[in-house]
């Protein structure tokens, strides 16, 4: 068998809502993956599990099942949404995210995703993790790759 390549493309959109009383931020983050099947037979994308971390705390999880079948030597782009909640011990972020004097309220989130594919009864898991900027202050649609947080990926000077 040839490889199945999973490429995390980035955040596609982030939709924000607030609970004023609870000082809680709700972020629905839609991500984009490219999955390439380099084989001469079809593979099934059985599930995608994803989680989002802020400051080493898991703030959201999602799981998609029976997603699609990718034909031989084909590629499919898949969007998945992770609902996240920034609350409780992180409610201090409410003040930052709701500052009306700041135009872009970027926070750095770690996106983790695991794709499970199956073919001929064989199962394979591919995982990726990436740091991304997300604006927690307004609804935002991103150009693909626009939200990448490069600083984290650079070696220390």
């Amino acid at each position: 068998p040839r490889s199945i390549d999973v490429k995390y493309i980035g955040v596609k959109s982030a939709y924000v809502s607030y609970d004023v009383q609870k000082r809680t931020i709700y972020l629905n983050i839609t991500n984009t993956l490219n999955i390439t099947n380099n084989n001469y037979y079809s593979v099934e994308v059985e599930n995608i599990t994803a989680q989002v971390q802020f400051s080493k705390t898991v703030i959201g999880k999602a799981r998609l099942n029976n997603i699609t079948i990718i034909g031989p030597l084909d590629m499919k782009q898949i969007d998945y949404t992770v609902p996240t909640v920034i609350a409780e011990e992180m409610s201090y972020m409410y003040d930052f995210c709701t500052l009306i004097s700041i135009k872009v309220h970027n926070i750095v989130l770690m996106m983790q995703v695991t794709v499970t594919t199956t073919y001929f009864g064989h199962s394979e898991q591919i995982s990726q993790e990436r740091y991304q900027y997300v604006d927690c202050g307004r609804n935002t649609t991103y150009q693909l790759g626009q939200s990448e947080y490069l600083n984290v990926l650079q070696p220390q000077q």
Epitope: T98, L99, I100, S101, K103
Partner: antibody, heavy 119, light 112 residues
Framework: QVQLQQSGAELVKPGASVKISCKGS????????MNWVKQRPGKGLEWIGQ????????NYNGKFKGKATLTADKSSTTAYIHLSSLTSEDSAVYFC????????????WGQGTSVTVSS | DVVMTQTPLSLPVSLGDQASISCRSS???????????LHWYVQKPGQSPKLLIY???NRFSGVPDRFSGSGSGTDFTLKISRVEAEDLGVYFC?????????FGGGTKLESK
């Protein structure tokens, strides 16, 4: 420390236009909204509008649309207000004021520029 | 536009007295994010306004604790517990919850 230095007083004729500058220093100029406020002699304060130097985005008080145009030059960290078709009603002191991030108020002000419209 | 009404117009005080300025808005100043954007500024003759109190009750850096702000919704008050000579000037309330931002007409704090 934050400083907003405005250009000097202007005496202009009715119907003419004028451009006032406000040079910001001591902070990240591109990342803060710059506001403009009008004060007529012995009168209160009127908010004209604001500009975000990072991308040139503007918000205006409807009363000043067509009268005032706000621009900013990131390279020289200077904000400008252009006032057109001047009348005696435009004679006033014009202030620039930075919108602070955490107090969410106009926490630093220029010294003001006096504009006198007279024939 | 939101109308900000300040009273009194003029406030003669003796040094050491308490002073109280009222500011009323024509509609609620509570933003959808739960914060209330009511600020107070003071302007001395020939100077630009200076921020005194932000978001109802927070003293700006360097502002003495004899200044305090209170209120909610549409009714707000600025108090100076013991007026000093350097406090004399014109006090403005301002709202930035609604566009356009608007100011009160000003209260002149003067010596009796």
């Amino acid at each position: 420390q934050v400083q907003l230095q405005q250009s000097g007083a202007e005496l202009v004729k009715p119907g003419a236009s004028v451009k006032i500058s406000c040079k910001g220093s001591g902070y990240a100029f591109s990342s803060y909204w710059m506001n403009w406020v009008k004060q007529r002699p012995g009168k209160g304060l009127e908010w004209i509008g604001q500009i975000y130097p990072g991308d040139g985005d503007t918000n205006y008080n409807g009363k000043f649309k067509g009268k005032a145009t706000l621009t900013a030059d990131k390279s020289s960290t200077t904000a400008y207000i252009h006032l057109s078709s001047l009348t005696s009603e435009d004679s006033a002191v014009y202030f620039c004021a930075r919108w602070g991030h955490y107090d969410e108020a106009m926490d630093d002000w220029g010294q003001g520029t006096s504009v006198t419209v007279s024939s | 536009d939101v109308v900000m009404t300040q009273t009194p117009l003029s406030l003669p005080v003796s040094l050491g007295d308490q002073a109280s300025i009222s500011c009323r808005s024509s509609q609620s100043l509570v933003h959808s994010n739960g914060k209330t954007y009511l600020h107070w500024y003071v302007q001395k003759p020939g100077q630009s306004p200076k921020l005194l109190i932000y978001k109802i009750s927070n003293r700006f850096s360097g502002v003495p604790d004899r200044f305090s702000g209170s209120g909610s919704g549409t009714d707000f008050t600025l108090k100076i517990s013991r007026v000093e000579a350097e406090d004399l000037g014109v006090y403005f309330c301002s709202q930035i919850t609604h566009v356009p931002w608007t100011f009160g007409g000003g209260t002149k704090l003067e010596s009796k």
